[in-house]
């Protein structure tokens, strides 16, 4: 049996229904069997877990996703073995295996792989600061969301009106969420906002930086 699945990875927003397309061509016999299984990201295919079987004319959902899986067409004997997964969770991200077995059609292995990513908006990030907050010193502002798929990008902005910082005194890394402030001055004091963004949305946190004379540095 030759199985056809999309070459592109599938992305589905959190809570929505994922449709994992799997089609095939074979003269379906009474021994026809379909198995859908799942493997977590980074794990080998050999560690896949079954989530649905179809055999002898009957459908058998199984495992932790059993209440949320069904077939687009039941019985899946018309060439369409597409899986529907409702109310997707972050833990549904991974690789799904569609395997069709129909003896004596052994021309190919009857296996198709689909990568699913569950899209999750960024959670409210945590803002933190470390380093010297006295004039002339340097500090790092950090921002991190515990949730978000794809991984959020981070952007720091300073709120309110302020003199333009000298070039190189503010360097940010959108991937790590770190903002490095060097050669601090009293005018570096103020509120800084970090916005975590991905295609599903954005979330932010704020941090107030107080730059002091060398004798007394602190963050409020």
């Amino acid at each position: 049996v030759e199985v056809k699945v999309p070459t592109e990875p599938l992305s589905t927003p959190l809570g929505k229904t994922a449709e994992l397309t799997c089609t095939y061509s074979t003269s379906v016999g009474d021994s026809f069997a379909l198995e859908w299984s799942f493997v977590q990201p980074g794990k080998p295919i050999s560690e896949s877990h079954p989530i649905l079987y179809f055999t002898n004319g009957h459908l058998y959902p199984t495992g932790s996703k059993s209440k949320r899986v069904s077939l687009l067409q039941n019985p899946p004997t018309v060439g369409v073995a597409t899986l529907k997964l409702t109310d997707v969770h972050p833990s549904d991200t991974g690789t799904y295996l569609c395997q069709v077995n129909n003896p004596p059609d052994f021309y190919t292995n009857g296996l198709g792989l689909i990568n699913l990513t569950v899209l999750v908006p960024p959670s409210n990030p945590l803002c933190s600061q470390s380093g010297q907050t006295s004039v002339g010193g340097s500090t790092a502002l950090r921002c991190s969301s515990s949730e978000g798929a794809p991984k959020p990008v981070y952007n720091w902005v300073r709120l309110g009106t302020f003199p333009t910082p000298s070039p190189g005194s503010m360097v940010q890394d959108e991937v790590s969420g770190q903002l490095i402030l060097t050669n601090l001055s009293l005018t570096s004091s103020g509120t800084y906002r970090c916005v975590a963004t991905n295609q599903m949305g954005s979330a932010s946190c704020e941090l107030t930086l107080s730059v002091t004379e060398p004798s007394q540095g602190r963050v409020a």
Epitope: K4, S25, T26, V28, G29, D30, V78, P104
Partner: antibody, heavy 118, light 107 residues
Framework: QVQLVESGGGLVKPGGSLRLSCAAS????????MSWIRQAPGKGLEWVSS????????HYPDSVKGRFTISRDNAKNSLYLQMNSLRAEDTAVYYC???????????WGQGTLVTVSS | DIQMTQSPSTLSASVGDRVTITCRAS??????LAWYQQKPGKSPKLLVF???TLPEGVPSRFSGSGSGTEFTLTISSLQPDDFATYYC?????????FGQGTKVEIK
Amino acid sequence: QVQLVESGGGLVKPGGSLRLSCAASGFTFSNSGMSWIRQAPGKGLEWVSSISDGGLYTHYPDSVKGRFTISRDNAKNSLYLQMNSLRAEDTAVYYCARQGVRPFFDYWGQGTLVTVSS
Amino acid sequence: DIQMTQSPSTLSASVGDRVTITCRASENIYSYLAWYQQKPGKSPKLLVFNAETLPEGVPSRFSGSGSGTEFTLTISSLQPDDFATYYCQHHYVIPWTFGQGTKVEIK
């Protein structure tokens, strides 16, 4: 050699019923998916129904679903098509065909003519 | 349903001609296509399956090609026995459908 011989065609009134038969020989019938395909006079081919090797799975296009029933008797090497609620547009030569491992049709019978007319 | 469209509907040719018939699918059917030959009053005969595979006994002057949505059946040198009607059929997902046919007649 593979032989498929259809029978049971004839003249029937609209709304009537007819049962077609196909006698198979020359191959292991119980291992083969089978189909019925029809051809209206002077027209093209239309797949009408299929059945799996043991009869567990049957399929139909929308044009005949609910009116036609395909069945088989592997002990008799026979395929059947029960046609109910016949319409004028069901008039055609009905062929019995064996499916390959993929659903193309590698052997065909000679056909039997079904005429639906008042 | 997947629609199959053949062109031309009729083709006039002479013995020895190279003849090409085209079949288009309304959506991607990969290589799941078969070709049949039918002579008047006879049942169809399988010529090609999986777009390009010839069953045993089919003369090598017949060849099939294509994938996706566009397919061709070629007769490299038309013989007197080849004047007939040719049909394509997808063997992908049910319902399996046929093209409307191409009649190859003597010029």
